[in-house]
Interface confidence: low
C-alpha cells in the first residue's frame, strides 16, 4: 500500500504543479507542443513521458523565471513505477511522441492535467477492485 | 500578505455538528492543495484531511473517516470541513494548512487556528 | 501507518548551545519529511521541507539531514526565540503523520 500512496502522492503533485504553471503560462515560450490527448489505454504512461519530454520552457521575462525553471523541472522528474507503467513500457503499439496533435502551452498543460486526473482515477479504481499496481 | 483564516468553531454537544471554514488570501488559492491539522488540548498535532488543488483527490486520518467532509470553494477562495457526529475527542485546535506546492513537501501556511470544544 | 518517533522528547539546554533533534520514521519515507516549530499559542511555523532545504525567511543556523527512515533537525547556536516544541512531520504516504513532538526548554 504504501509504495501506492507514494506514486499517488507524486501524481498529485504533478496535477497541483500544472495548475502552477498554468498562472504562468504568458512567461511561457509559445511554441507548439506533443500535447496527447483521448489517450488509448494502456498507452496513458507512454503519452505521460511525452509530455514529459516536451520542451517547455520560460521565456526569460521577469522575476517568474527561476520559479518556472523549478516546477518545469519537477514536471520532468520520475515518479515512482508501478507494475502498470511497466507493463506499458513493453507496449510497442503506443504513438509517437511526434504524432500527437501540437499544441501551444495553455492548452498543452490543460492536456496534460487531464491526462494525470485520468492516471489517478485509473490508479484509485485499480485499487478499488483489488488489483495493486506498487 | 499571504493569510489563512479559520471560522466556524465553538462548543457542540457530542453527536452534533459543525462547519469549519478557512478564507484565503495573498496568493492563487486554486493552485495549492490545502490540508486541515488538528491539536488536542496538550498534546501534538494530527493530520485530518487533505484536498487537492481542483478537489480530485481527497483523503482522511482514519480516525475522521465517514464523519468529516472536507471541501473548497476555489471561486471564493475557501476551504471547508464539515464535522458529523462529533465526539469528545474532536476537541482541539483545528487549523487549516496549505500544502507547499510546486512538488515540495511540507505546510508552509497556516491559520491561527480555531477551538472545537465537543462536551455534553 | 508509517509512524514518526523523535527524541528525546523533551530537552534542556542553554542560549549558544548546538541541538540536535532526531526523527525516525518506521519504514523508508525517502526524503519526504519537514520540520516544524511551535510556540505556545501559536500555529506551527515550517523550519525545513524536503527533510534539509531551508525555508525562506528562517535562520541559517536551523538545519535538516537525513533520508530514507532516520532525520535530524539542529540547531547550530540556541537563541533565546528557539524554546519551542518541534515537529516532524512525513508525506511519503497517506495518512500524513507527524512526531509526537520534542519541547526545547531553557536549562
Known amino acids: 500500500m504504501q509504495g501506492q500512496d507514494r506514486h499517488m502522492i507524486r501524481m498529485r503533485q504533478l496535477i497541483d504543479i500544472v495548475d502552477q504553471l498554468k498562472n504562468y503560462v504568458n512567461d511561457l515560450v509559445p511554441e507548439f507542443l506533443p500535447a496527447p490527448e483521448d489517450v488509448e489505454t494502456n498507452c496513458e504512461w507512454s503519452a505521460f513521458s511525452c509530455f514529459q519530454k516536451a520542451q517547455l520552457k520560460s521565456a526569460n521575462t521577469g522575476n517568474n523565471e527561476r520559479i518556472i525553471n523549478v516546477s518545469i523541472k519537477k514536471l520532468k522528474r520520475k515518479p515512482p513505477s508501478t507494475n502498470a507503467g511497466r507493463r506499458q513500457k513493453h507496449r510497442l503499439t503506443c504513438p509517437s511522441c511526434d504524432s500527437y496533435e501540437k499544441k501551444p502551452p495553455k492548452e498543452f498543460l490543460e492536456r496534460f492535467k487531464s491526462l494525470l486526473q485520468k492516471m489517478i482515477h485509473q490508479h484509485l479504481s485499480s485499487r478499488t477492485h483489488g488489483s495493486e499496481d506498487s | 500578505e499571504v493569510q489563512l483564516v479559520e471560522s466556524g468553531g465553538g462548543l457542540v454537544k457530542p453527536g452534533g455538528s459543525l462547519r469549519l471554514s478557512c478564507a484565503a488570501s495573498g496568493f492563487i488559492f486554486s493552485s495549492y492543495s490545502m490540508n486541515w491539522v488538528r491539536q488536542a488540548p496538550g498534546k501534538g498535532l494530527e493530520w485530518v484531511s487533505s484536498i487537492t488543488s481542483g478537489s480530485y483527490y481527497i483523503h482522511y486520518a482514519d480516525s475522521v473517516k465517514g464523519r468529516f467532509t472536507i471541501s473548497r470553494d476555489n471561486a471564493k477562495n475557501s476551504l471547508y470541513l464539515q464535522m458529523n457526529s462529533l465526539r469528545a475527542e474532536d476537541t482541539a485546535v483545528y487549523y487549516c494548512?496549505?500544502?507547499?506546492?510546486?512538488?515540495?513537501?511540507?505546510?508552509?501556511?497556516w491559520g491561527q487556528g480555531t477551538t472545537v470544544t465537543v462536551s455534553s | 501507518a508509517i509512524q514518526l518517533t523523535q527524541s528525546p522528547s523533551s530537552l534542556s539546554a542553554s542560549v549558544g548551545d548546538r541541538v540536535t533533534i532526531t526523527c525516525r520514521a518506521s519504514q523508508d519515507i525517502e526524503s519526504a519529511l519537514a520540520w516544524y516549530q511551535q510556540k505556545p499559542g501559536k500555529a506551527p511555523k515550517i523550519l525545513i521541507h524536503d527533510a534539509s532545504s531551508l525555508e525562506s525567511g528562517v535562520p541559517s543556523r536551523f538545519s535538516g539531514s537525513g533520508s530514507g527512515t532516520d532525520f535530524t533537525l539542529t540547531i547550530s547556536s540556541l537563541q533565546p526565540e528557539d524554546f519551542a516544541t518541534y515537529y516532524c512531520?512525513?508525506?511519503?504516504?497517506?495518512?500524513?503523520?507527524f512526531g509526537q513532538g520534542t519541547k526545547l526548554e531553557i536549562k
Open positions: 494548512v496549505r500544502e507547499r506546492g510546486w512538488g515540495y513537501y511540507g505546510m508552509d501556511v
Open positions: 512531520q512525513q508525506f511519503n504516504s497517506y495518512p500524513y503523520t
